[in-house]
């Protein structure tokens, strides 16, 4: 016979029969379930009807409370309880001691260096606004519309101009505080600065005075020009620019002292402001003499353009430069203003992109470098500032000179394009600690090859192997050249190759590494203690 029994929950106390001591009125308690909504603290319990089963279940009811307390107080159980308690605390103390030992003995995490914004990625030069945007459309308002493209390249700074008023070779008609109306107004510039800031793109203004003339510094009126530059620095810093560039400083008498003075103004305003100087010189001694008096100066030069495009010579140039500059932050480019294609054959562009993005320092590119823009392929276009090929409509002068794969639009749609490679490298460069500020170690890999490791503390490490030659080569990676902190593993994963056909992510045996002509490899491997 079924019955509902109401139990007041408040009355369930320890001195009554505990649930497990109550006879089970259903097989394994399965029939016990809630049989109604909660009502005034009461719970309805549905009891099974099968009394035969209930009787069978009631045969063993366990120890009573008195019996349980009696057994628990016996000497055997007391000793067992103490032993377990002691064991627990000993184990706990042992683990604590182990953790302390591990922490104490573990290698210290290397303190991160102070990172300025220009340390975190590439700079992108737009020396000719009209050529960059397409003829008839080159102004500051139009440039604002191209900031999303710059964001997609993950560049950290835009080196703009010069855009100031400059009547060729006329100091009196050169005003570094005024924007040439052909490029827009001060309001347009302010608006560009605001938009760039929102996209985390810094703006560096080129103040090379006589940019339309024969001598960039007017040669005979150096002091007048220097004063103009000083005034301009203060004016544009107040306007919110993030830095300045001055080019052709080999034409500036007493360049070192002027640069030091301008650097003081720039850094005096904020340590977060940058001064870039450009020179056509490729002579290391001249470059070093400019750097010596200016600790935070970023210098672009033609130093690397003399590499002769051989692995050994490039390795020698890079290592000499890094040794000579010590722990100074470097920049890497092939010139102060020109396109990579001015110096390199098409087949070496990918290799150089890989190298510039993975050397320690700031890579500096000119607009168009990311697509391999080549003035020689565009008849009539100036070598120093050809029209940017956004799409096939960008060069209507001679349409047949432009094919889809030469344009931003065409290359954006092709994962194997130079532009896609640029974007990937730029992304890696801006997020991997070993590439951001890691140590650099070049080592022998055989004739024609240039190889090096970038590593930072216990972060993922990168191995770069570059084949500058026009024949395939086997890399004999000489790990003996490397310090213990930068040892090579037996295998490394392929992050990317400059040539198609390799399976990315696959592990490559470093002893059996073969490179195609003009191929560059970027490999990654974990830190091993």
């Amino acid at each position: 016979m079924s019955q509902d029994t109401e139990v007041d929950m408040k009355e369930v106390e320890l001195n009554e029969l505990e649930p497990e001591k109550q006879p089970m009125n259903a097989a394994s308690g399965a029939a016990m379930s809630l049989a109604g909504a909660e009502k005034n603290g009461l719970v309805k319990i549905k009891v099974a009807e099968d009394e035969a089963e209930a009787a069978a279940a009631a045969k063993f009811t366990g120890l009573s409370k008195e019996e349980l307390l009696k057994v628990a107080g016996s000497p055997g159980w007391v000793r067992t309880r103490w032993a377990l308690l002691l064991l627990f605390w000993l184990g706990w103390l042992g683990m604590l001691a182990g953790a302390v030992v591990i922490i104490v003995r573990a290698p210290r995490c290397r303190e991160l260096p102070a990172q300025k914004w220009w340390h975190t990625g590439a700079l992108y030069r737009i020396g000719d606004l009209q050529a960059f945007q397409g003829h008839g459309a080159g102004n500051l308002a139009g440039l604002k519309g191209r900031l999303d493209y710059l964001s997609s390249l993950k560049v950290k700074g835009l080196v703009l101009g010069p855009i100031h008023k400059n009547q060729k070779d006329d100091v009196a008609q050169t005003d570094l505080l005024q924007i040439d109306p052909n490029f827009g107004s001060k309001e347009d510039f302010d608006s560009l600065l605001q938009s760039a800031k929102k996209k985390s793109i810094r703006v560096i203004l080129d103040l090379t005075p006589n940019y339309r003339g024969e001598n960039s510094w007017f040669s005979t009126q150096v002091d007048t020009v220097a004063t103009k530059v000083k005034d301009a620095l203060e004016f544009w810093l107040q306007a919110g620019v993030d830095g300045f560039q001055v080019r052709d400083i080999e034409n500036l008498k007493d360049a070192s002292s002027f640069l030091a003075e301008w650097q003081n103004i720039t850094k005096g305003f904020s340590e977060d402001r940058l001064l870039i100087a450009g020179t056509n010189s490729s002579d290391l001694q001249q470059i070093l003499s400019l750097l010596e008096s200016n600790k935070d100066l970023l210098l672009t030069s033609s130093y690397l353009s003399d590499s002769g495009s051989t692995g050994e010579h490039t390795k020698s140039l890079v290592t000499q430069y890094l040794n000579a500059t010590g722990n100074r932050w470097c920049s890497w480019s092939l010139s102060q203003a020109r396109l990579l294609t001015s110096f390199l054959p098409a087949q070496l562009l990918r290799l150089y992109q890989l190298m510039l993005f993975t050397l320690p320092g700031t890579p500096v590119f000119s607009y168009g470098d990311e697509i391999g823009l080549d003035a020689a392929a565009l008849p009539g276009q100036p070598m120093e500032a050809p029209v940017m090929l956004w799409d096939e409509s960008s060069f209507p002068d001679i349409p047949g000179a432009v094919s889809a794969n030469m344009t931003v639009k065409g290359q954006s749609e092709d994962p194997g394009s130079l532009l896609s490679l640029f974007r990937r490298l730029s992304d890696q460069r801006s997020k991997e600690r070993s590439l951001l500020h890691g140590d650099f170690h070049a080592f022998s890999a055989g004739p024609g090859l240039f190889s090096y490791i970038r590593h930072w503390d216990q972060n993922e490490r990168f191995l770069v192997v570059l084949n500058f030659g026009d024949v395939g080569l086997s890399a004999g990676l000489q790990a003996s050249d490397l310090p213990a902190s930068a040892s090579l593993p037996a295998k490394a994963d392929l992050l990317l190759s400059t040539q198609p056909g390799r399976e990315e992510g696959s592990p490559l045996e470093l002893e059996r590494l073969k490179l195609e002509p003009h191929e560059g490899l970027l490999l990654r491997f974990p830190y091993a203690a």
Epitope: G136, G380, Q381, P382, P396, D397, I398, P399, G400
Partner: antibody, heavy 122, light 113 residues
Framework: QVQLKESGPGLVQPSQTLSLTCTVS????????VIWVRQPPGKGLEWMGI???????NYNSALKSRLSISRDTSKSQVYLKMNSLQTEDTATYYC????????????????WGQGVMVTVSS | DTVMTQTPSSQAVSAGEKVTMSCKSS????????????LAWYQQKPGQSPKLLIY???TRESGVPDRFIGSGSGTDFTLTISSVQAEDLAVYYC?????????FGAGTKLELK
């Protein structure tokens, strides 16, 4: 008004170098490109090369190894130099102005010089 | 290079007659972005230098009589002289400027019957 005028020797010895001058007026060489075209007797027109407004040059690939075009903007003159002349280089040589609309350089030629006849013979 | 083929190589005509000459290019000279055809026609009278007649395949240069009519598609172009005058006797050249290097046709010579 726009004018172009070629000048140079009428007779050149084989294997010697041809030097021609194109003197322009009515426009600036800093704004317009100038081309050289030649025409062997009784034959068609052959484009030889161009010097652009910015000073860049391009040449007909068949002539590239022995042709050089330069200019002096202050004198408004364009120069053609071609070495290792052979009898088949006998032709009338013309200079012409490359069209420019202020923005684009479209490749047709709106003004021509009167031409200079050059004979290559010993 | 883009090859320009002109036909006929010569043509005998009478004054007042309508005449057409053809120029074919080895690749299209129509640029889809601006819908323009990159073809020019020149006239070279005996003993004179060439003179620009037509550009963009159909636009007459200023001062050129309207009896000269240029037409054509992307690869096939025609120069028509609606009523030939004695002063029109000359060699006519077509030239493409869509590709570089620029190339000329071999010419069509217009003679009197």
């Amino acid at each position: 008004q726009v004018q172009l005028k070629e000048s140079g020797p009428g007779l050149v010895q084989p294997s010697q170098t041809l030097s021609l001058t194109c003197t322009v007026s009515g426009f600036s060489l800093s704004s317009y490109g100038v081309i050289w075209v030649r025409q062997p007797p009784g034959k068609g027109l052959e484009w030889m090369g161009i010097i652009w407004a910015n000073g860049n040059t391009n040449y007909n690939s068949a002539l590239k190894s022995r042709l050089s075009i330069s200019r002096d903007t202050s004198k408004s003159q364009v120069y053609l130099k071609m070495n290792s002349l052979q009898t088949e280089d006998t032709a009338t040589y013309y200079c012409a102005r490359h069209y420019y609309d202020g923005t684009h350089y479209y490749g047709y030629f709106d003004y021509w010089g009167q031409g200079v006849m050059v004979t290559v013979s010993s | 290079d883009t090859v320009m083929t002109q036909t006929p190589s010569s043509q005998a005509v009478s004054a007042g007659e309508k005449v057409t000459m053809s120029c074919k290019s080895s690749q299209s000279l129509l640029y889809s972005e601006n819908k323009k055809k990159y073809l020019a026609w020149y006239q070279q009278k005996p003993g004179q230098s060439p003179k620009l007649l037509i550009y963009w395949a159909s636009t007459r240069e200023s001062g050129v009589p309207d009896r000269f009519i240029g037409s054509g598609s992307g690869t096939d172009f025609t120069l028509t002289i609606s009523s030939v005058q004695a002063e029109d006797l000359a060699v006519y050249y077509c030239q493409q400027y869509y590709n570089f290097p620029y190339t000329f046709g071999a010419g069509t010579k217009l003679e009197l019957k």
